[in-house]
């Protein structure tokens, strides 16, 4: 029993890191491995992680975390009974994927604007509270390429709109997802979407120019 | 071995500002969040506020904002609290403690007076 | 903020009997990544606190299995089996979970 692809490893900078490896064959990850790991700190311990399959020679690994500092530094080693396959090290702030934003709502009682809202999915007493940045995508059920997304760059987890900027009488699905500039984040999961009738009334003589906003990172 | 050694006692005049000194031996205080536990006489523990020394990120009960100012210098192995505008319910024993995640290590305290 | 009530305020124990000190946090102290960070803490006369309890039920390293945690929600408690002589102070309990954080008021243990 060999590791075909070293385990490599995202944090949440909260609570869970996960790690990823793929075996040279078909391994019942649960039964036949596992993963252990300690923070470089004292009196720290280690932990035992059993991971799950994730497809046919790959396994998944969750690791818990009670807290974690910019300088953390874990110990990994990967064990097959008594075998050790692989050691390594993990520095969580190096490989950061945010927690998806929740409860998204798009309040539309206010005249002619869409506000759209979520929660940011940090405490305060994390870094990553005041230091994310967001994308919200907005699309059309109806009509594929009417697809946008708008770059929210301020702290505050909302967006205003103007109801006439989309289509009127139709619904649009919306959905947001997060990342932060000061690790080098990689962007988190969209949240759920939520979906609305877009009932804006457009005066008759009005003529609509959509822009699409594209964001590459 | 494992040490938060803060530095002595203070006494100042009503208005003062006031820093004290919090240092780390057997670790590196940027492996940990540094927090800092106000004492009033005869009574019980009150938290101030923490910070985590590598990104300077700090955070504060709503009583102390504006009141106390807390940094860090990992070059050291230093924390610092800074107290403003000093008034009689100042006075108290401050201990800086590291928490990783728990208050394992405490510091002496340093025991700062305000009196006229 | 979440505010910490301890019972009783104070207690007269003779040596090896038990204890019980009940700690109660006015909201839940479950952290957002699910751990309850209730802690209790033990203050020597003339001696900075020292953690007895960590995440409710941990014993932290070199304190005497006499001190138990234990609880859930917003109701906690932490237990010696058999008090000792070294055992008097004040005892705290604290939340970590939610900024900010906070003790309870203190509960003063004494010998009789």
């Known amino acids: 029993m060999k590791v075909l692809q070293e385990p490599t490893c995202v944090s949440d900078y909260m609570s869970i890191s996960t790690c990823e490896w793929k075996m040279n064959g078909p391994t019942n990850c649960s039964t036949e491995l596992r993963l252990l790991y300690q923070l470089v700190f004292l009196l720290s311990e280690a932990h035992t992680c059993i991971p799950e399959n994730n497809g046919g020679a790959g396994c998944v690994c969750h690791l818990l975390m009670d807290d974690v500092v910019s300088a953390d530094n874990y110990t990994l080693d990967l064990w097959a009974g008594q075998q050790l396959l692989w050691k390594g090290s993990f520095k969580p702030s190096e490989h950061v994927k945010p927690r998806a934003p929740g409860n998204l709502t798009v309040h539309t009682n206010v005249s002619d604007t869409l506000l759209l809202t979520w929660s940011n999915p940090y405490p305060p007493d994390n870094y990553l509270y005041n230091h994310l940045t967001y994308a919200v995508n907005i699309w059309s059920e109806n009509d594929p390429a009417d697809f946008r997304i708008y770059n929210v760059t301020y702290l505050e987890p909302s967006l205003r709109i103007a109801a006439s900027t989309l289509k009127s009488g139709i619904s649009y699905r919306a959905r947001v997802r997060a990342w932060a500039q000061c690790y080098n984040t990689t962007w988190s999961e969209w949240s759920p979407s939520t979906k609305w009738h877009n009932s804006y009334r457009e005066p008759f003589e009005q003529h609509h120019h959509h822009h699409h906003h594209h964001h590459h990172h | 071995e494992v040490q938060l050694v803060q530095s002595g006692a203070e006494v100042k005049k009503p208005g003062a500002t006031v820093k004290i000194s919090c240092k780390a031996s057997?670790?590196?205080?940027?492996?940990?969040?540094m927090h800092w536990v106000k004492q009033a006489p005869g009574k019980g523990l009150e938290w101030v506020g923490r910070i985590d020394p590598t990104n300077g990120y700090t955070i504060y009960a709503s009583k102390f904002q504006g009141k106390a100012t807390i940094t860090a210098d990992t070059s050291s192995d230093t924390a610092y609290m800074e107290l403003s505008s000093l008034r009689s319910e100042d006075t108290a024993v401050y201990h800086c403690?590291?928490?990783?995640?728990?208050?394992?290590?405490w510091g002496q305290g340093t025991l700062v007076t305000v009196s006229s | 903020d979440i505010v910490m009530t301890q019972t009783p305020l104070s207690l007269s124990v003779t040596p090896g009997q038990p204890a019980s000190i009940s700690c109660r946090s006015s909201?839940?102290?479950?952290?957002?990544?699910?751990?309850?960070?209730l802690e209790w803490y033990l203050q020597k006369p003339g001696q900075s606190p020292q953690l007895l309890i960590y995440k409710v039920t941990n014993r932290f390293s070199g304190v005497p299995d006499r001190f138990s945690g234990s609880g859930s929600g917003t109701d906690f408690t932490l237990k010696i089996s058999r008090v000792e002589a070294e055992d008097v102070g004040v005892y705290y309990c604290?939340?970590?979970?939610?900024?900010?954080?906070?003790f309870g008021q203190g509960t003063k243990l004494e010998i009789k």
């Open positions: 057997g670790f590196n205080i940027k492996d940990t969040y």
């Open positions: 604290f939340q970590g979970s939610h900024v900010p954080y906070t």
């Open positions: 909201q839940s102290i479950v952290h957002s990544n699910g751990n309850t960070y």
């Open positions: 403690v590291s928490r990783r995640p728990w208050f394992a290590y």
